[in-house]
Amino acid sequence: AVNGTSQFTCFYNSRANISCVWSQDGALQDTSCQVHAWPDRRRWNQTCELLPVSQASWACNLILGAPDSQKLTTVDIVTLRVLCREGVRWRVMAIQDFKPFENLRLMAPISLQVVHVETHRCNISWEISQASHYFERHLEFEARTLSPGHTWEEAPLLTLKQKQEWICLETLTPDTQYEFQVRVKPLQGEFTTWSPWSQPLAFRTKPAALGKDT
């Protein structure tokens, strides 16, 4: 028997993916476990194999269909269970009735690119991935820029309160290497959280022109 405190947290990406993390103090490392999704009003059900991400936590992604297909709505309730093998039987380790649109976490923004760079400013664009058409343009973004000698945690957060998939960074230092990240969040959902940060985009500002005061 496995004892200890258990936490089972899942998020819906608003389209066709439910990502889950299960943590269990004192869990057995060699036990095979999976997450099983059973919707209350759909004809499909889905399973994914939990894989270790740390000493006492496991994660998996329930793929519900094609990436941009709308597989769930606000009225769906999905029973999610953690099942672990005990000999020839499966034991239920955790269970929750999951309301997908109350537990949203979108995919990280993708396709970050420098549109234009100067000595003191840089225009960057990105795209959102697998976000439901229900949101239309009603999303918010946070962005941060990593300056030399600083950490990501020290970087001030820039907030964009609308679906604006670009930003113009200003007051930058000439001939300096920077990195940039962005994340996205819908307005809907009591337990909704920010997406993961995007992959960092590295860029360098242009050097100041020689003999000119910039």
Epitope: T74, V75, F135, E136, H138, L139, L187, Q188
Partner: nanobody, 119 residues
């Protein structure tokens, strides 16, 4: 301003049929679910049937096999085809729509239409 307008209610004999309609109109919205609920005096409003995006219909136990819900997402209209009606089906039938407006989801209700089944 969003409006839900029901029609098609009335008086019918036991064993008869009725077809209810509900149309959603108003400012810009996206509907992800539409359905029907009913209320009889002294009781809670109960689900009759609803249909979510992806075509998943859900029916109340007492109407399964007798009632059929149809949804036209283009016209923002939901229909309830009721057959083999009995006096227990008497009540006020309310249309409900789950609508996305400016990035948030809310439920909207119609005023209701009376269905009376006489024995």
């Amino acid at each position: 301003q969003v409006q839900l307008v029901e029609s098609g209610g009335g008086l019918v004999q036991t064993g008869g049929s009725l077809r209810l309609s509900c149309v959603v109109s108003g400012s810009h919205f996206i509907s992800d679910v539409m359905g029907w609920y009913r209320q009889v005096p002294g009781k809670q409003r109960e689900l009759v049937a609803d249909m979510a995006d992806g075509g998943s219909a859900k029916y109340g136990d007492s109407v399964k096999g007798r009632f059929t819900i149809l949804r036209d997402s283009v016209k923002n209209t939901v229909y309830l085809q009721m057959s083999s009606l009995n006096p227990e089906d008497t009540g006020v039938y309310y249309c409900k729509a789950g609508l996305w407006i400016t990035g948030r989801h809310s439920d909207y209700w119609g005023q209701g239409t009376q269905v009376t089944v006489s024995s």
